[in-house]
Interface confidence: medium
């Protein structure tokens, strides 16, 4: 309707404020300049806006910034984020921890939406690395945020930002994403003691080669199951009865109960008989006395 | 230079009917929400009703629905409160005021007693 | 008993700055804004701050405001006499579709 495209007479808007909330869509579109709204997006987020206006809102502001929205607009956009698409957020330059920091507690108490990852994305790519303050706030907001990242992109966490990281951060981590990190956690704990030091590793362990863990066994540090079921097969599989019993300590008993499961069955299949009946847990499956056991992968490596 | 007065007020008794208007200046009436708040005698402040500019939804606050009524006529520049079966706890200063989220200018008040 | 709760008194010297805190104890008011307002002695009330943090022109800019979640203040700094009075802390409850004061503070300037 063509009339309808005029401001009403006394209706233009002076300043974003609450009277707004009364006025019809095609009001909202004709009586609010969007260099205004613009000026005065920290007001939006205070007054109780319908989503079909701010669809208009969000409309004004697209036309006024057809490149992308400048950071000025972004840090205030409250509520009206989650009308972004991702490719809105495409065109943003967010180079503040503040800005990041409001979009996320616009998103706060729900999973990770396209528009939050693509968000993140903009952000961590605009800084170059994931620095610790960006991790602290991202895994505040999404404790598996880490787990989320390819390991690629974990390759550019320095190892100073892993002492932001807490275990719950990295419940769902698969091995090649610990591969990344186990090594960078090494390096930013190395100066610590034994048993501090075995602390705050214990969450990365699921990344460790078998010789950390042979290094490991010669400390006292008493791994429970959880942690030793989260290790790579690979890096079990060459310990021997002696140091498993030394790594878990008093909780080599709990191998009993996870006889079935990898990588205790593999590990069980590895060990001669006679070494797992030491452990006095009855586990069954080892190699029987008398069996000569050929290590093939150094055979293939010297030949 | 908005101004708001109120007027209507007075004594009555428990169970009668009061009205109270508030004529307003100064600013656009019909573009703005209105509201009433009251206050009684030594305590806080209470929100009573509120208006949209069009009249087209009206709030009331618990202890006042079904008794009072809140109109408007934007013609006039009047803001009005219709208050029935009136108790002695109604018995307060009642300021009308612009808006509804944040009252940014308010009227001097007008007094209703109510008792016996 | 009000979602929104305020201490019932504060006081300050002359040159202090003074806080004043109002909690709200319903998530139905964590989006929406915190207006306040000062009540003098005998006079009808006055906005303060509105949009939580906004000032009307013509309130001193020693009056400021702030909400963080569920948790709003309003902070007075270069306390003067003539700031004794109550203050209230307003806000829209989307569950009570209604507006919600604080219980009011009452500020003495020693």
């Known amino acids: 309707e063509v009339e309808k495209t005029a401001c009403p007479s006394g209706k233009k808007a002076r300043e974003i404020d609450e009277s707004l909330i009364f006025y019809k869509k095609w009001e909202l579109e004709a009586c609010v300049d969007a260099a205004l709204l613009a000026t005065q997006m920290d007001r939006v987020n205070a007054i109780p806006f319908t989503y079909e206006q701010l669809d208009v809102l969000k409309h004004k502001l697209d036309e006024l910034y057809p490149q992308g929205y400048p950071e000025s607009v972004i840090q205030h956009l409250g509520y009206l984020f989650l009308k972004m698409s991702p490719e809105d957020i495409r065109k943003w330059n967010v180079t503040s921890l503040e800005t990041l920091k409001a979009l996320l507690e616009v998103n706060k108490g729900h999973e990770m939406s396209p528009q939050v990852a693509t968000l993140i994305d903009r952000f961590v790519k605009g800084r170059g690395q994931l620095d610790k303050d960006t991790l602290d706030t991202l895994t505040a907001f999404y404790p598996g945020y880490l787990c989320s990242l390819s390991p690629e992109e974990l390759s550019s966490v320095p190892p100073s930002s892993i002492w932001a990281v807490r275990p719950q951060d990295l419940d769902t981590c698969d091995p090649r994403q610990l591969d990344v990190l186990y090594p960078k956690a090494r390096l930013a704990f190395q100066n610590m003691n034994g048993s501090e030091y075995f602390v705050k590793i214990q969450s990365f362990l699921g990344g460790a080669p078998t010789e950390d863990l042979k290094a490991l066994s010669q400390q006292n540090v008493s791994m429970d199951l959880a942690t030793f079921m989260k290790l790579r097969t690979d890096a079990v599989l060459p310990l021997t009865v002696a140091e498993v019993q030394k790594l878990l300590g008093p909780h080599v008993e709990g191998l009993k109960a996870e006889e079935r499961h990898r990588p205790v069955r593999d590990w069980i299949l590895r060990q001669r008989q006679d070494d797992l009946d030491t452990l006095g847990l009855g586990l069954q499956g080892g190699i029987p006395n008398g069996y000569l056991v050929l290590d093939l992968s150094m055979q293939e490596a010297l030949s | 230079e908005v101004q708001l007065l109120e007027s209507g007020g007075g004594l009555v008794q428990p169970g009668g009917s009061l009205r109270l208007s508030c004529a307003a200046s100064?600013?656009?009436?019909?573009?703005?929400?209105m509201s009433w708040v009251r206050q009684a005698p030594g305590k806080g402040l209470e929100w009573v009703s509120g208006?949209?500019?069009?009249?087209?939804?009206?709030y009331y606050a618990d202890s006042v629905r079904g008794r009072f009524t809140v109109s408007r006529d934007n013609s006039k520049n009047t803001l009005y409160l219709q208050m029935n079966s009136l108790r002695a706890e109604d018995t307060a200063v009642y300021y009308c005021?612009?808006?509804?989220?944040?009252?940014?200018?308010w009227g001097q008040g007008t007094l209703v007693t109510v008792s016996s | 008993q009000s979602v929104l709760t305020q201490p019932p008194s504060a006081s300050g010297t002359p040159g202090q700055r003074v806080t004043i805190s109002c909690i709200c104890s319903?998530?139905?008011?964590?989006?929406?804004?915190v207006s306040w307002y000062q009540q003098l002695p005998g006079t009808a009330p006055k906005l303060l701050i509105y949009?939580?943090?906004k000032r009307p022109s013509g309130v001193p800019d020693r009056f400021s405001g702030s909400k963080s979640g569920t948790s709003a203040s309003l902070a007075i700094s270069g306390l003067r006499s003539e700031d004794e009075a109550d203050y209230y802390c307003?806000?829209?409850?989307?569950?009570?579709?209604?507006?919600?004061f604080g219980g009011g503070t009452k500020l003495t300037v020693l």
């Open positions: 319903s998530s139905n008011i964590g989006s929406n804004a």
């Open positions: 100064g600013f656009t009436f019909s573009n703005y929400a």
């Open positions: 005021a612009k808006n509804m989220l944040s009252f940014d200018y």
């Open positions: 949009y939580n943090s």
């Open positions: 307003g806000s829209w409850d989307s569950s009570l579709n209604g507006y919600v």
């Open positions: 208006i949209p500019p069009d009249s087209g939804s009206k």
